[in-house]
Interface confidence: low
């Protein structure tokens, strides 16, 4: 298990939901879909109704304003994306409401959202060298990079 970084000792405060019902596509034009009640996967789909819609909630970060800490929730549910360890699938965890504050082990729910042009990256706050990633014929997981795909396009207004 990768050690938690010092960032895990910080407290993050919820600001607001900044994106509603968006879809994530990787650079192979695979879309994130549900694999089962606990996991996500990526597949080439023909109908965007099949895609998972996400909401993104922003949190304050006193350390580095260039990195926005966000939480990812499946729209119209109480399921949140939670990081595990390297090459482990991200989990969908149920919480009754969006956390007002996040600290310690709960930073598994937070990702630094970075954008470079049309590319979007989600870096685990708990494991700052690991990204949300897709992998051929596998679950959405945490990875450092290739052969997993770590950059995503955000498709908005898909409701």
């Amino acid at each position: 298990s990768a050690p938690f970084s010092f960032l895990s000792n910080m407290t993050y405060h919820f600001i607001r939901i900044i994106k509603h019902e968006f879809i994530l596509n990787d650079t192979l034009n695979q879309t994130i879909i549900r694999a089962n009640d606990q996991y996500l996967t990526a597949a080439a789909i023909h109908n965007l109704d099949e895609a998972v819609k996400f909401d993104m909630g922003a949190y304050t970060s006193s350390k580095d304003d260039t990195k926005v800490p966000v939480i990812l929730r499946i729209s119209k549910t109480q399921l949140y994306v939670s990081a595990q360890d390297e090459d482990q699938p991200v989990l969908l965890k149920e919480m009754p409401e969006i956390p007002k504050t996040i600290t310690g082990s709960e930073t598994n729910f937070l990702f630094f959202w970075e954008t470079h042009g049309t590319k979007n990256y989600f870096i685990s706050v708990a494991h700052p060298n690991l990204f949300i990633a897709t992998k051929h014929d596998n679950w959405v997981c945490l990875a450092k990079g290739l052969p997993s795909i770590t950059d995503f396009q955000i498709l908005e207004n898909q409701a």
């Epitope: 879909i33 694999a35 089962n36 009640d37 606990q38 109704d49 099949e50 895609a51 998972v52 965890k93």
Partner: antibody, heavy 122, light 107 residues
């Protein structure tokens, strides 16, 4: 081959509890949630809830909250359903079923156990 | 909870007949509709998911269609082994409710 094998039939008295097991094989147990569904004689299907096999967290349907408990033994890839304070209307076949989301958020149950008959009678 | 209403509750048909079962949801379920087959004394089996997609290994005589609140399950040419009860189930919102079932018999 994916298989879910359930424990045998049970006869219980009103007020008692019953615990049904469901042993999974042929796939990675922790990667798929396990549902419990019941079917009263000659009736339809009623989903009781599910357990997250990775975290152990359970979600119960409103009609069963407070009376049902789902547990796991991950070392043997076995899920359990315990129903307490049994009454005659709990007489039913109880199924475990693996869940899958084939597309988007479309929830389905792709593999089922053979069912366990629970009879509640004084 | 979303209510699922299936019709008819039972039907009798001959081998080779085209058989149709309908399922209506109490609200829009966005094509998140599954069909199961249950033979007497057996567990249900998933046949169709997401309105029209056949689970691998399911014969092509089974099909599904629909949208919004109204969905249809069709057997294009009834076979003796198709005698069973068929259930629809909405896959959109927990507790993922089922229809009451349609019992199919051979004339």
């Amino acid at each position: 081959e994916v298989q879910l094998v359930q424990s045998g039939a049970e006869v219980k008295k009103p007020g008692a509890s019953v615990k049904v097991s469901c042993k999974a094989s042929g796939y990675t147990f922790k990667y798929y949630g396990m549902n419990w569904v019941r079917q009263a004689p000659g009736q339809g299907l009623e989903r009781m809830g599910w357990i997250n096999t990775y975290t152990g967290q359970s979600t119960y349907a409103d009609d069963f909250k407070g009376r049902v408990t789902f547990t796991l033994d991950t070392s043997t890839s076995t899920a359990y359903m315990e129903l307490s304070s049994l009454r005659s209307e709990d007489t039913a076949v109880y199924y475990c079923a693996r869940d899958i989301y084939y597309y988007g958020s479309d929830f389905a149950m792709d593999y089922w156990g053979q069912g366990t008959t629970v009879t509640v009678s004084s | 909870d979303i209510q699922m209403t299936q019709s008819p509750s039972s039907l009798s048909a001959s081998v080779g007949d085209r058989v149709t079962i309908t399922c209506r949801a109490s609200q829009d379920i966005s094509n998140m509709l599954n069909w199961y087959q249950q033979k007497p004394g057996k567990a249900p089996k998933l046949l169709i998911y997401y309105t029209s997609r056949l689970k691998p290994g399911v014969p092509s005589r089974f099909s599904g269609s629909g949208s919004g609140t109204d969905y249809t399950f069709t057997i294009s040419s009834l076979q003796p082994e198709d005698i069973a009860t068929y259930f629809c189930q909405q896959g959109k919102t927990a507790p993922y409710t089922f229809g009451q079932g349609t019992k199919l018999e051979i004339k």
